[in-house]
């Protein structure tokens, strides 16, 4: 069995989680990728997916989650912006390869989000004044919804597609460095 390892990210509310999931370039470059949360005593939930087939360095935004798949580097970049305490939990990157079972990418991500320091705004010496601007994106066929033997690679019906706000843009301030601590189960 694959040894499950965790990488711990400790961040404050309002900051951004920025992780990179590596994958085998030749095998999975155009495969659809997903970001899942695994909560104790719950079924996992797929929160967001890249398009199908996955487009190179094309940002897909679902709520506060932004996925970017860099084919030439063999990595999926996942950002969760404006973090909230309730975002704390265990996450993982997944590659869909129908009709085979999804391929889980390790390490899993243990995200711990705590309340920011009280006091003067901007007094945190670690904070940097970063602003992310995500270009407006319309995303189709975000996650595999209906797969049958005849339509494994077919996009789901139009009515089930997620469409982001046409003029959506995310501006972030006070994005601090990420603390990465490997944790082994």
């Amino acid at each position: 069995a694959t040894k499950l390892t965790e990488e711990k990210y400790e961040l404050k509310e309002g900051q951004t989680l920025d992780v990179k999931c590596d994958y085998t370039l030749e095998k999975f470059a155009s495969s659809q990728k997903a970001w899942q949360i695994i909560r104790d005593g719950e079924m996992p939930k797929t929160l967001a997916c890249t398009e199908r087939p996955s487009k190179n360095s094309h940002p897909v935004q679902v709520g506060r989650i932004i996925l970017e798949d860099y084919h030439d580097h063999g990595l999926l970049r996942v950002r969760m912006v404006n973090l909230q305490v309730e975002d704390s939990g265990l996450y993982q990157c997944v590659i869909y390869q129908p009709p085979k079972e999804p391929h889980m990418l390790f390490d899993r991500i243990r995200l711990v989000v705590t309340k920011g320091f009280s006091g003067t705004p901007g007094s945190n010496e670690n904070s940097t004044q970063n602003v992310y601007k995500i270009p407006p994106t319309t995303t189709k066929a975000l996650c595999p919804l209906y797969t049958s033997p005849r339509t494994v690679t077919q996009a789901p019906p139009k009515s089930t597609a997620d469409v982001s706000t046409p003029d959506s843009e995310i501006n972030l301030t006070n994005v601090t460095d990420i603390i990465r601590v490997p944790v082994f189960n």
Epitope: M43, V62, G63, C143, Y146, T147
Partner: antibody, heavy 122, light 113 residues
Framework: QVQLVESGGGVVQPGRSLRLSCAAS????????MHWVRQAPGKGLEWVAV????????YYADSVKGRFTISRDNSKNTLYLQMNSLRAEDTAVYYC???????????????WGQGTLVTVSS | DIVMTQSPDSLAVSLGERATINCKSS????????????LAWYQQKPGQPPKLLIY???TRESGVPDRFSGSGSGTDFTLTISSLQAEDVAVYYC?????????FGGGTKVEIK
């Protein structure tokens, strides 16, 4: 066209066992989480159990925990519910239902079987 | 457990009129990270299994008439039938699949006035 067909219901005495089956067709069964939901006569819907697409995750309602077991055979496109130590309050129509999205991309259950009636009575 | 409370228990509406059903969850069913509410609406006609109408609180399932719409976020949700048709007579249920155990509202019976 997706079809879910339940079978195995019937009349059984309290304390006895019953095994329900749900045969699926028209979908890649092994990609979907599956649920059992029941409905007592004239009552509302009650979730019973869920199993993940690969069988690795299983969860139960407190009312059936320790008595019912959900399982699946992806090679046969079939979902099962083993019901032991049956009680009168387990009397209901039992439905199997498929999650709308594959691989945990779920909200809502898109396809339901017609149901099979389980009557627990002495 | 998340308790789902539906109101009213029953509703009589004239053909062509609007029907509104409310559903309240005892805690939020919104995943704020992906901005999705894990709430669905079902229609059940006598002797039939439930049929999915709305998922993620406001997205209509494929093939469902556009007179059905869902709205709300967090803990308060509404199913609206904009112009009631005879074939809409049924019991309607809300359901959360945000967290286990998954729970349903008690149902709202919609009839023709």
């Amino acid at each position: 066209q997706v079809q879910l067909v339940e079978s195995g219901g019937g009349v059984v005495q309290p304390g006895r066992s019953l095994r329900l089956s749900c045969a699926a067709s028209g979908l890649t069964f092994s990609s979907y989480g599956m649920h059992w939901v029941r409905q007592a006569p004239g009552k509302g819907l009650e979730w019973v159990a869920v199993i993940s697409y690969d069988g690795s995750n299983k969860y139960y309602a407190d009312s059936v925990k320790g008595r019912f077991t959900i399982s699946r055979d992806n090679s046969k496109n079939t979902l099962y519910l083993q019901m032991n130590s049956l009680r009168a309050e387990d009397t209901a129509v039992y439905y199997c239902a498929r999650e709308r999205g594959t691989y945990y991309y779920a909200s809502g259950w898109a396809n339901w079987g017609q149901g099979t009636l389980v009557t627990v009575s002495s | 457990d998340i308790v789902m409370t539906q109101s009213p228990d029953s509703l009589a509406v004239s053909l062509g009129e609007r029907a509104t059903i409310n559903c309240k969850s005892s805690q939020s069913v919104l995943f704020s990270s992906n901005n999705k509410n894990y709430l669905a609406w079902y229609q059940q006609k006598p002797g039939q299994p439930p049929k999915l109408l709305i998922y993620w609180a406001s997205t209509r399932e494929s093939g469902v008439p556009d007179r059905f719409s869902g709205s709300g976020s967090g803990t308060d949700f509404t199913l609206t039938i904009s112009s009631l048709q005879a074939e809409d007579v049924a019991v309607y249920y809300c359901q959360q699949d945000f967290s286990l155990p998954y729970t349903f509202g008690g149902g709202t019976k919609v009839e023709i006035k």
